[in-house]
């Protein structure tokens, strides 16, 4: 999954306990509530490693955001805490209980509005926008050479439909701010520009709405110039791990590269007490590379099962074209069995799964 | 304007060698790129291959692979299609196109465009 | 390979007439769809991209819908120079592959 920087959660000071696998859970909380929202195992068996979800965007753990394995905690709700929350087996990323989450002005009275008041006569439960495909919205990067033609979409749903608009840096973008216009598509919540130029450098973000929640996803556009490049890594990925022992990890590492590029993951390793030879080079192995049935999305994902302190380290994404290498590392901090509820650190995500 | 036009088609023996080139101005395709498509008399399109000048690769159609090879002469604003081991199932009017990418974060691909096409030039294989 | 089939293979129709034509790709294309005409002994001219969009300088009269396997191209009222041969094409499968074109024809 991605971890946004935009995404936060909400909550309310009692447990809600999560609908049936299939079922979404209309929930309606009051301005500064803190929120559990609870989702035990199906058929209370064993759930495995679990990850939560807001509009698509996987959840960084906080201090004001306490994820454990069948539990969100969250502190201090607000407006744009609104949306879709899921419960997903981490590995199938099969949804395990969703929840639509509405965060009002006023602090709640303790009792779940149901918005029926509200409610367009559709025959269909309201509810705040989400993202149909969240799978296809994890990729934030996209660089384009001159001259090409972008196009960004946010496929939403949500009762009543919402809305789509567009910001530029955050503010409103229209065809007039560009030379040649924009092309809009309301229905297929697309927005395109055609023979894009260097000017057209930017974040752009999406924000699909309607009258019970606000979604957003931001995409930065690089426009390149001239000549290829080697392999661009986006920015804060891989990201640092707290894991308990035993449980699993993944790192990411998004890749862009005009030419082919060739992704490895390497651990950094000692020889004879050293972590670099003669030559400064660090002592790495590799622990994936390209095979002849492996994709770049499967090679952009690095899993670590069942860790163990040995696993605790360094970890290289490393990604080469004709051109050249691009490297982005993180490291593993592997605790000993404690909590299922614990809290993360600045160093990055915390899973006890 | 945008303008492309294609050359050195001409008739040639089966097994036989042609080189076509398609000299573009208007615009560079340092960014973007050129695709060759063909049409055998009286049927439909086929596409051939492409170069993708931004990164020098280039694609085909299973049908070519091994035989044709597109290339560019930048400073030229260039590209050719060099046609070895011609088949009778080679006889077609070829047209070279200039192509533009979509590219679709969302939908994790690029899409292929042919947006300015040049006037074709016949290559007929037969003994 | 994807195979694009369209349908009808050619028609008749009277300038003013609305046409439809539908082209159908053998697996998911997602939106990656381009439409093409071409008249006898002329180059292609694009139509429209990604599905739905109109290429620059294409008449307003033309439109493209669709999305997976289903697409289908509109002309809204058809005029004397919109007689040709009609070809969908996509490119989000290698290698790109065009459908056997329609013909459209004047009654």
């Known amino acids: 999954e991605s971890l946004g920087t935009e995404q936060r959660v909400v909550g309310r000071a009692a447990e809600v306990p999560g609908p049936e696998p299939g079922q979404q859970e209309q929930l309606v909380f009051g301005s500064g509530d803190a929120v559990e929202l609870s989702c035990p195992p199906p058929g209370g068996g064993p759930m495995g490693p679990t990850v939560w979800v807001k509009d698509g965007t996987g959840l960084v753990p906080s201090e004001r955001v306490l994820v454990g394995p069948q539990r969100l905690q969250v502190l201090n709700a607000s407006h744009e805490d609104s949306g879709a929350y899921s419960c997903r087996q981490r590995l199938t990323q099969r949804v395990l209980c969703h929840f639509s989450v509405r965060v009002t002005d006023a602090p709640s009275s303790g009792d779940d509005e149901d918005g029926e008041d509200e409610a367009e006569d559709t025959g269909v439960d309201t509810g705040a926008p989400y993202w149909t495909r969240p799978e296809r919205m994890d990729k934030k990067l996209l660089a384009v050479p001159a001259a090409n033609t972008v196009r960004f979409r946010c496929p939403a749903a949500g009762n009543p439909t919402p809305s789509i608009s567009w910001l530029k840096n955050g503010r409103e973008f229209r065809g007039e701010h560009r030379i040649g216009g924009i092309k809009l598509r309301h229905q297929q919540w697309s927005l395109v520009m055609e023979s894009v130029v260097p000017s057209d450098r930017g974040n752009y973000t999406c924000v699909v709405e309607n009258k019970f929640g606000s979604i957003r996803q931001t995409y930065t556009l690089d426009v390149l110039e001239r000549s290829p490049h080697r392999p661009i890594l986006q920015a804060g990925l891989p990201a640092n791990q707290t894991a308990v022992l035993g449980s699993d990890v993944e790192f990411h590492c998004k890749v862009y590269s005009d030419a082919q590029p060739h992704i490895q993951w390497l651990k950094h390793v000692e020889v004879n007490g050293s972590k670099v030879g003669p030559d400064g080079t660090p002592y790495v192995t590799v622990l994936k590379t390209a095979g002849a049935n492996t994709t770049d999305k499967e090679l952009e994902v690095l899993s670590l099962h069942n860790v163990t302190f040995e696993d605790a380290g360094e970890y290289t994404c490393l990604a080469g074209n004709s051109i050249g290498f691009s490297h982005h590392s993180a490291w593993l901090v592997v605790l000993p069995a404690e909590e299922e509820l614990v809290e993360a650190d600045e160093a990055g995500s915390v899973y006890a799964g | 304007e945008v303008q492309l036009v294609e050359s050195g088609g001409g008739l040639v023996q089966p097994g036989g060698s042609l080189r076509l080139s398609c000299a573009a101005s208007g615009f560079t395709f340092t960014s973007t790129g050129i695709s060759w498509v063909r049409q055998a008399p009286g049927k439909g399109l086929e596409w051939v291959g492409r170069y993708w000048a931004w990164d020098g690769s280039t694609n085909y159609a299973d049908s070519v692979k091994g035989r044709f090879t597109i290339s560019a002469d930048t400073s030229k604003n260039t590209a050719y299609l060099q046609m070895n081991s011609l088949r009778a199932e080679d006889t077609a009017v070829y047209y070279c196109?200039?192509?533009?990418?979509?590219?679709?974060?969302?939908?994790?691909?690029?899409?292929?465009?042919?947006?300015?096409w040049g006037q074709g030039t016949l290559v007929t294989v037969s003994s | 390979d994807i195979q694009m089939t369209q349908s009808p293979s050619s028609l008749s129709a009277s300038v003013g007439d609305r046409v439809t034509i539908t082209c159908r790709a053998s697996q998911d294309v997602d939106t990656s769809l381009a439409w093409y005409k071409q008249k006898p002994g002329k180059a292609p001219k694009l139509l429209i991209y990604?599905?739905?969009f109109l290429y620059s300088g294409v008449p307003s009269r033309f439109s493209g819908s669709g999305s997976g396997t289903d697409f289908t191209l509109t002309i809204s009222s058809l005029q004397p120079e919109d007689f040709a041969t009609y070809y969908c094409?996509?490119?989000?499968?290698?290698?790109?592959?065009f459908g056997q074109g329609t013909k459209v024809e004047i009654k």
């Open positions: 196109a200039r192509t533009y990418g979509i590219y679709d974060i969302y939908g994790g691909y690029t899409e292929y465009v042919m947006d300015y």
């Open positions: 990604s599905a739905s």
């Open positions: 094409q996509q490119s989000t499968g290698h290698p790109q592959t």
